[in-house]
């Protein structure tokens, strides 16, 4: 067990002469906060998985108001470290995503508006217990400077936090079979602490907190003898002479989810569904209020002004879970007809229709499009006897064969800046405008011309398009 720690040193203009506009203005003061997402660096599923090693949000930084005419300085930062606790071994190689978010504090309807200012990513090698590693990354016109380290929580030590150390019982030497615990020579390597209740006779462990059974024993704590009667559904022949092989402990045995979380098995591990008020890989993070920003993926946090009263996350379309951390697979309902391919974009469903079909759910049969193909997932649209291709985002031209930059069409109105991000384009709006494409003016009295937002999405929430 241990903690990954991230210290943000500065977030300010990059090295070039063209200083970026300050993200805050006298009319729209704002403050920054940061989110870090960690994944094991070399696991096959890491690229698309959620933050399997953990995630953390910083506190909000001090409120900043731009001085008119002054260049954007380094922006005031939140106090303290971002800490991501990890319960198991530190993997050594990890991937990170660090996001810089802006919280606008103008007279927004329904509370402050969030928008993503910058996002950096990388993969690094890092031994637990080592010194702080410093990094500098550019994101658009901004530059982020930060340091990070992984440290073990006592009694764990070592580069992966898998060895355990205890103070010496005798002043001169360690007990039988136990070595001094370098670099803490005054401590001794301790026997591994297995899962609480693990049978000392029939169980053992190679990692802290696990319980592996000797042959002939099973159950989460290795207290159940393998049946010697005939097996109803054996998994295979047993090398023990005592009968049949019983399935070994599964990832949810002994329920690794704390604080009343419920465990469900996944192909490689397990997933905890946490009750309100708790989150984290094993529901181990508690005492959370809306001030901690526990709602992911643009979820709106309501209630929970103090740690004893639960908060509720109102999730935007496409996300669910007590912290909006799970993507809803709405394509499983097979909404696209006529063999259309379903794409869940988070904010909406899209059907990519086969040639000859069109419509939001590919429900229209197009005669004009018979035998006509639009490349790269483009959709053929009927047009008075001639076919026309409606191209998937990222492509253009008559038959959608030309690759297009999602920002090339200048989709952000009123001087908004377009950024291509992992999940599509994001518009950073000029002061006085809001909306997914900066199309709505914010009225001086704080009301906006924005239409009613869908449930769980507030005006000003960052909205992404693939």
């Amino acid at each position: 067990a241990g903690v990954f720690e991230l210290q943000i040193h500065s977030f300010g203009p990059g090295p070039g002469p063209g200083a970026p506009r300050s993200p805050c203005s006298a009319r729209l003061p704002c403050r920054l906060f940061f989110r870090v997402c960690l994944k094991p660096g070399l696991s096959e599923e890491a690229a698309e998985s959620p933050c399997a090693l953990g995630a953390a949000l910083s506190a909000r930084g001090p409120v900043y108001t731009e001085q008119p005419g002054a260049p954007a300085p380094d922006l005031p930062l939140p106090d303290g470290l971002l800490q991501v606790p990890f319960r198991d071994a530190w993997p050594g190689t990890f991937s990170f995503i660090i996001e810089t978010w802006r919280e606008e504090l103008g007279d927004q309807i329904g509370g402050p508006a969030w928008s993503l200012l910058a996002r950096v990513a990388g993969r690094r090698r890092l031994a637990a217990g080592g010194p702080w590693a410093r990094d500098i990354q550019r994101a658009g016109a901004w530059e982020l400077r930060f340091s990070y380290r992984a440290r073990c929580e006592p009694p764990a030590v070592g580069t992966a936090c898998t060895r355990l150390c205890r103070p010496r019982s005798a002043p001169s030497r360690c007990g039988p079979g136990l070595r001094p615990c370098a670099p803490l020579e005054d401590e001794c390597e301790a026997p591994l602490v297995c899962r609480a209740g693990c049978s000392p006779e029939h169980g053992f462990c190679e990692q802290p907190g696990e319980c592996r059974c000797l042959e002939g024993w099973t159950g989460p704590l290795c207290t159940v003898p393998v049946s010697t009667s005939s097996c109803l559904s054996p998994r295979g022949p047993s090398s023990a002479t005592t009968g049949c092989l019983v399935p070994g402990p599964g990832p949810c045995d002994g329920n690794p989810c704390a604080n009343g979380g419920s465990c469900s098995e996944t192909p490689r591990s397990f997933e905890c569904t946490c009750p309100r008020g708790f989150y984290g890989l094993r529901c181990e993070v508690s005492g959370v209020t809306c001030a901690d920003g526990p709602c992911f993926n643009g979820g709106l946090c309501v209630g929970g002004a103090d740690p004893d009263s639960a908060y509720i996350c109102h999730c935007p379309p496409g996300f669910q879970g007590s912290n909006c951390e799970k993507r809803v697979d709405r394509c499983s309902l097979q909404p696209c007809r006529n063999g259309g391919l379903c794409l869940d974009l988070g904010h909406a469903l899209r059907c990519r229709c086969r040639a000859g079909f069109a419509g939001p759910r590919c429900e229209h049969d197009l005669d004009d499009c018979a035998g006509r193909a639009c490349a790269n997932g483009g959709t053929c649209v009927e047009g008075g006897g001639a076919h026309r291709c409606s191209c998937a985002l990222g492509f253009g031209g008559r038959d959608c064969r030309e690759r297009a930059d999602p920002c090339a069409a200048r989709p952000c109105a009123h001087g908004g800046r377009c950024y291509a991000h992992f999940s599509g384009l994001v518009c950073a709006c000029a002061p006085g405008y809001m909306g997914a494409r900066c199309e709505f003016p914010v009225h001086p009295d704080g009301a906006s011309a924005l239409p009613a937002a869908p449930p769980g999405l507030r005006p000003g929430d960052p909205q992404r398009y693939l």
Epitope: P15, A47, I97, V120, A121, G122, R123, R124, R125, A133, R134, D135, I136, Q137, R138, A139, G140, E143, D405, C407, Y419, A420, H421, F422
Partner: antibody, heavy 117, light 107 residues
Framework: QVQLQQSGPDLVKPGASVKMSCEAS????????IHWVKQKPGQGLEWIGY????????NYNVKFKGKATLTSDTSSSIAYMELSSLTSEDSSFYYC??????????WGHGTTLTVSS | DIQMTQSPASLAASVGETVTITCRAS??????LAWYQQKQGKSPQLLIY???SLEDGVPSRFSGSGSGTQYSMKINNMQPEDTATYFC?????????FGAGTKLELK
């Protein structure tokens, strides 16, 4: 303006070592990393590693570990790269470049190294 | 190491033409991609970073796009001074790795 001034060409014998320099000016030396990149004539670019002059942390391409040693002197704003046990394979053009961990935004003019007996 | 496959190896274009160079990474590099221009006998120069951010002082006819493992750089309205070799480079993981380069000549 930012400038990186590299030392002159070197002709050295096989088996010897060479230490080339990269003098930075026009910015705070400890604020950015110094990367080193190898380029054989008419060929592509190969990243050797970088040094953080702020704390002398280094990050090497495994291929150049044991071959290249990166150091820096903050008092004179100079970064150094020493190449050891030289062979004809090390004959090349070597660039230093200022940057973040991901972006090399200013480059020196390069140093030519010739290894020949 | 992450491999970067750049194409084409060389091409010739006339003044005013649009040129596209592509780069494929052996795994997702999350926009950690830069493009560099190297003219004959000169040092490389940074053009684009974070896949689509234009470095200060670089003409706006240069643009970058892409995501995941596929990236491209486009030169709209080719000019004689764009004759050079162009390299892509990933910086998601160490070691930083470059593409083999694309030599762009004037037709």
């Amino acid at each position: 303006q930012v400038q990186l001034q590299q030392s002159g060409p070197d002709l050295v014998k096989p088996g010897a070592s060479v230490k080339m320099s990269c003098e930075a000016s026009g910015y705070t030396f400890t604020a950015y990393f110094i990367h080193w990149v190898k380029q054989k004539p008419g060929q592509g670019l190969e990243w050797i590693g970088y040094i953080d002059p702020f704390n002398d942390d280094t990050n090497y391409n495994v291929k150049f570990k044991g071959k290249a040693t990166l150091t820096s002197d903050t008092s004179s704003s100079i970064a150094y790269m020493e190449l050891s046990s030289l062979t004809s394979e090390d004959s090349s053009f070597y660039y230093c470049a200022r940057g973040t961990s991901a972006t090399l935004d200013y480059w020196g003019h390069g140093t030519t190294l010739t290894v020949s007996s | 190491d992450i491999q970067m496959t750049q194409s084409p190896a060389s091409l010739a274009a006339s003044v005013g033409e649009t040129v596209t160079i592509t780069c494929r990474a052996s795994e997702n590099i999350y926009y950690s991609l830069a493009w560099y221009q190297q003219k004959q006998g000169k040092s490389p120069q940074l053009l684009i970073y974070n896949a689509n951010s234009l470095e200060d002082g670089v003409p706006s006819r240069f643009s970058g796009s892409g995501s995941g493992t596929q990236y491209s750089m486009k030169i709209n309205n080719m000019q004689p001074e764009d004759t050079a070799t162009y390299f892509c480079k990933q910086a998601y993981d160490v070691p930083l790795t470059f593409g083999a380069g694309t030599k762009l000549e004037l037709k």
